[in-house]
């Protein structure tokens, strides 16, 4: 099979699949496309995984390149390390395999780089510009388990057709990921659909045993079934309903579990109750009632804005103090009048791209789980710590579920691995503590308050973030009306021990929103709550010094929360790195854990240790934090995030946001 045919192809093992998508994309577009299907760009870390990639890619043309999930920020060269300073998009630098095309050469590494794999020959790794739209990309999908391909039966009309959760359809799989559908056509004209499901005794298996093609129990009147009639092994028939319906009490007719609108925002058939509720981006399920949706405050997240953050229903915006202006990335502040490149497009064109209908987004493979189960890593699935998926899968697929990104797409990207973008489906580790700067940010004087827009324009349908199922881990979201928060960039701890681990850290329990990529957990969070602001007036902002008590009743309130962080043992087994290189035979490079420097978060501002409010214990090692791809260059000046495809009830003026409310909330995840 020619991998450069129009259709994607994949190869699956018992715990993960690789898929090749021959579609021209930039690195960011490719990363998004894999993420939207529930996976990540391929991270072949072992010789065995690399062999599977080799088999999948085959012998392509020398001119073709495929993105894999490796990227490096500018000036992050570490040529002595196996990955040379590159980081997997899963957030870490662990590897037991490399395949660089050339030996490492010294240099300043002035620009961000991403890695593509040659389609020909040895499938060597080449580095280059992340904004280049190369010929295709490799995704990796992990899962809890897999079902073996079905054995052909005598009565079959042809081979079973399998559809995976990531929308690849083929007859040639050896293993089928949990949640896959097998369609078997029988010579008698009927067929059977099987689902790869969890078995009561543990593990996964097909939803029914063979033989699948015998008897004629359904032939008269479809066995009395409204939708599907299934002939059981013992000869009797049972009725099933097509995706989106459940069997009614009579055992024959089918009903739509979402017809009575049991969910506040979105309902999807499947799950234990026959349906599962989902919240739009920017919202999360209420803990006391999973049918309702509430939201969280992005401004609580350390480093989400460099200076000031205003939160509103379903979104937030960053602002700068007097004498500073918002940088093109929509987050950073620089002295007014400083030269800086500006992106020429609005945010909507860039972050909220792909132009998909809300309907299409709803139909995407958003949820593997019923109810509100939040899973620790659909997107960084790995064999050693698989996520626990419950099943809520609808086996009806459009012909091409590949995200349709208009080409050529402008390549302003959101910042990668920076704690800014409430991009959907992020599964984020929160085992790194943060050091919050105790120095005061520069804030507007009382005489010249900043001008904050009083209205938040709704984005057009084309510019809205896709709807996300709530049983992906929750994203930090905005619902506290109008709270300005002064947050400081996160700092790496000064003396943390290095760690190499092949396991991902645990995530928080269900209903606790994980942090954004590269956001670190703060023991102390300074949130400045402001009094109510009349419409069309800018807020007057003051802030407290590091140890300065409130001076007046209306002064901002400091809220301090002690966060209990999980402690991960630092003793880790060493990794052995296998390297394929054209200049030398494959060799083994031992990379002891003790010698590898920690994978620091990228793009942290430099601050002196004296600005740190609390020392960080070395018992909190770095975790591997998933990174959002970041492409070079400026990003839009105003960061405006709207989570839903339908306009949210954002206040039309800051005054309506009731900034005076001091809403106490359970922010255990901060």
């Amino acid at each position: 099979q020619d991998p450069w045919a129009a259709e994607p192809r994949s190869a699956c093992g018992p715990s993960s699949c690789y898929a090749l998508f021959p579609r021209r994309r930039t690195f960011l577009e490719a990363w998004r496309a894999c993420r939207e299907l529930g996976g990540d760009l391929a991270t072949p870390r072992t010789p065995e995984e690399a062999q599977r990639v080799d088999n999948l890619v085959g012998a392509g043309p020398a001119s073709r390149l495929l993105w894999i999930g490796l990227q490096r920020q500018a000036r992050q060269c570490q040529l002595q390390r196996p990955l040379r300073g590159f980081t997997w998009t899963t957030g870490d630098q662990d590897t037991a395999f490399t395949n660089w095309a050339q030996p490492a050469t010294g240099g300043p590494c002035p620009a961000q780089r991403c890695v593509a794999l040659e389609a020909s020959g040895e499938h060597r790794w080449l580095e280059g510009s992340c904004t280049l739209a190369v010929d295709g990309y490799l995704c990796q999908f992990g899962f809890e388990g897999a079902c073996p391909a079905l054995q052909d039966e005598a009565g079959q009309a042809g081979p079973a057709v399998y559809t995976t959760p990531f929308h690849l359809v083929s007859t040639e799989f050896e293993w089928l990921p949990f949640g896959s559908v097998a369609a078997v056509q029988c010579q008698a004209g009927r067929g059977a659909s099987l689902l790869c499901v969890k078995q009561p005794e543990g593990g996964v298996g097909w939803s029914r045993a063979g033989p699948l093609c015998l008897g004629a129990g359904c032939s008269p009147d479809n066995g009395g079934c409204e939708h599907e009639c299934v002939e059981e092994v013992d000869g009797h028939v049972s009725c099933r309903c097509t995706e989106g319906f459940r069997l009614a009490a009579d055992g024959r007719s089918c009903e739509d579990p979402c017809a009575q609108a049991p969910c506040e925002q979105q309902c999807e058939p499947g799950g234990p109750q026959g349906y599962s509720c989902h919240c739009r981006l920017g919202f999360r399920p209420a803990e006391d009632d999973p049918h309702r949706c509430v939201d969280t405050d992005e401004c609580q997240i350390a480093g989400v804005c460099q200076q000031m953050c205003v939160n509103y229903v379903g979104g937030f915006e960053c602002y700068c103090s007097e004498g500073h202006e918002l940088e093109a990335d929509g987050i950073s502040c620089s002295p007014a009048g400083a030269m800086g490149a500006r992106a020429s497009q609005d945010l909507g064109d860039e972050l909220l791209d792909d132009g998909e209908d809300e309907e299409d987004e709803d139909e995407a493979w958003e949820a593997f789980g019923g109810g509100w189960t939040e899973m620790p890593g659909i997107l960084w699935m790995e064999p050693t710590q698989p996520p626990d998926f419950a099943l809520a899968y609808r086996p009806s697929f459009p012909e091409d579920r590949e995200p349709q990104i208009p080409y050529p797409e402008p390549t302003w990207p959101p910042p990668l691995s920076a704690p800014r973008v409430p991009y959907h489906s992020s599964v984020l580790s929160v085992t790194r503590p943060v050091v919050v700067s105790a120095t005061r940010p520069t804030l507007p004087s009382a005489h010249q308050p900043p001008v904050i827009p009083a209205t938040h324009p709704a984005l057009s349908r084309d510019h809205q973030i896709p709807v996300i199922a709530a049983n992906y881990p929750d994203l930090p979201s905005a619902y506290q009306p109008g709270i300005l928060s002064v947050s400081h960039p996160a700092q790496p701890p000064a003396h943390q021990p290095p760690m190499i681990s092949t396991r991902y850290p645990e995530l928080f329990p269900a209903h606790q929103s994980p942090m954004f990529p590269d956001t670190q957990v703060a023991g102390t969070q300074t949130t400045t709550h402001l009094p109510a602001i009349p419409p069309n007036r800018a807020p007057l902002v003051t802030t407290l010094g590091a140890h300065q008590p409130p001076q007046a009743p209306d002064a901002p309130v400091l809220r301090t929360q002690a966060t209990q962080l999980p402690i991960i043992p630092t003793a880790q087994p060493s990794l052995t790195t296998s390297s394929r290189s054209p200049v030398s035979p494959a060799h083994q490079v031992s990379v002891p854990a003790a010698t590898q420097p920690p994978a620091l978060p990228t793009l942290l501002p430099s601050q002196s240790p004296t600005n740190q409010t609390s020392p960080i214990s070395p018992t909190h090692p770095h975790s591997k934090v998933p990174q959002i791809p970041r492409e070079d260059g400026p990003s839009p000046k105003l960061a405006l995030w709207l989570p839903s495809a339908a306009p949210t009830a954002a206040p039309t003026a800051l005054g309506e946001a009731s900034l005076a409310e001091h809403i106490q909330r359970d922010d255990r995840w901060l």
Partner: antibody
């Protein structure tokens, strides 16, 4: 060594079609994409389209509204570019150029080798 | 389309001078920028690829820098054979290449 040798100059009437060739040598023809770029007198270089000889995949600059067709003859390691409905605005030097794949461990899509150019003059 | 604007369009310099040519893109092009040298009656020659990487055989006096929207080509010490026209090219939305209008470097 790598060489791209283009066909000779052409003088054409308005409304006519011109087809020029670009013969590649010194490398495996199907391993590299061929682009066509033109340069009108005193104007900047303008990309017209490309072909991947491996599978005849082509993409064209929308500006040429279907007037351009790029083909290859793999057996002859030669690329061709045909431009129809010529006008005086099409008077230019037409270059074929090879897109590089990788240099010293970097992938890149710059054009590493160029033909010498074919001058096309459109005049009534 | 992404537009590239070079400055200056013309410049005069002497042998031994340090020369800097700037190329601005109308939107972010990452580092997908190349620089070419073209002499009268000849095809362009690749000097710099991926914004800052010197192509094989190009003298070390040529260097490139920049990312995003602003790029520079620097000739550290001008030689007589360097008088030519220089073009920047972007290919971030490959295959839709665009070129700058050129900078003609003349002997003072």
């Amino acid at each position: 060594q790598v060489q791209l040798v283009q066909s000779g100059p052409e003088v054409m009437k308005p409304g006519a079609s011109v087809k020029m060739s670009c013969k590649a040598s010194g490398y495996t023809f199907t391993d590299y994409v061929i682009h066509w770029v033109r340069q009108a007198p005193g104007k900047r270089l303008e990309w017209m389209g490309y072909i991947n000889p491996y599978d005849d995949d082509t993409t064209y600059n929308q500006k040429f509204k279907g007037r351009v067709t790029i083909t290859v003859d793999k057996s002859a390691s030669t690329a061709y570019m045909e431009l129809n409905s010529l006008t005086s605005e099409d008077t230019a030097v037409y270059y074929c150029a090879r897109r590089g794949n990788s240099y010293d461990g970097y992938f890149d899509y710059s054009m590493d080798y160029w033909g010498q150019g074919t001058l096309v003059t459109v005049s009534s | 389309d992404i537009q590239l604007t070079q400055s200056p369009s013309f410049m005069s310099a002497s042998v031994g001078d340090r020369v800097t040519i700037t190329c601005r893109a109308s939107q972010n092009v990452g580092t997908a920028v190349a620089w070419y040298q073209q002499k009268p009656g000849q095809a362009p020659k690749l000097l710099i690829y991926s914004a800052s990487n010197r192509y094989t055989g190009v003298p070390s006096r040529f260097s490139g820098s920049g990312s995003g929207t602003e790029f520079t080509l620097t000739i550290s010490s001008l030689q007589s054979e360097d008088f030519a026209t220089y073009y920047c090219q972007q290919y971030t939305n490959y295959p839709m290449y665009t070129f700058g209008q050129g900078t003609k470097l003349e002997i003072k």
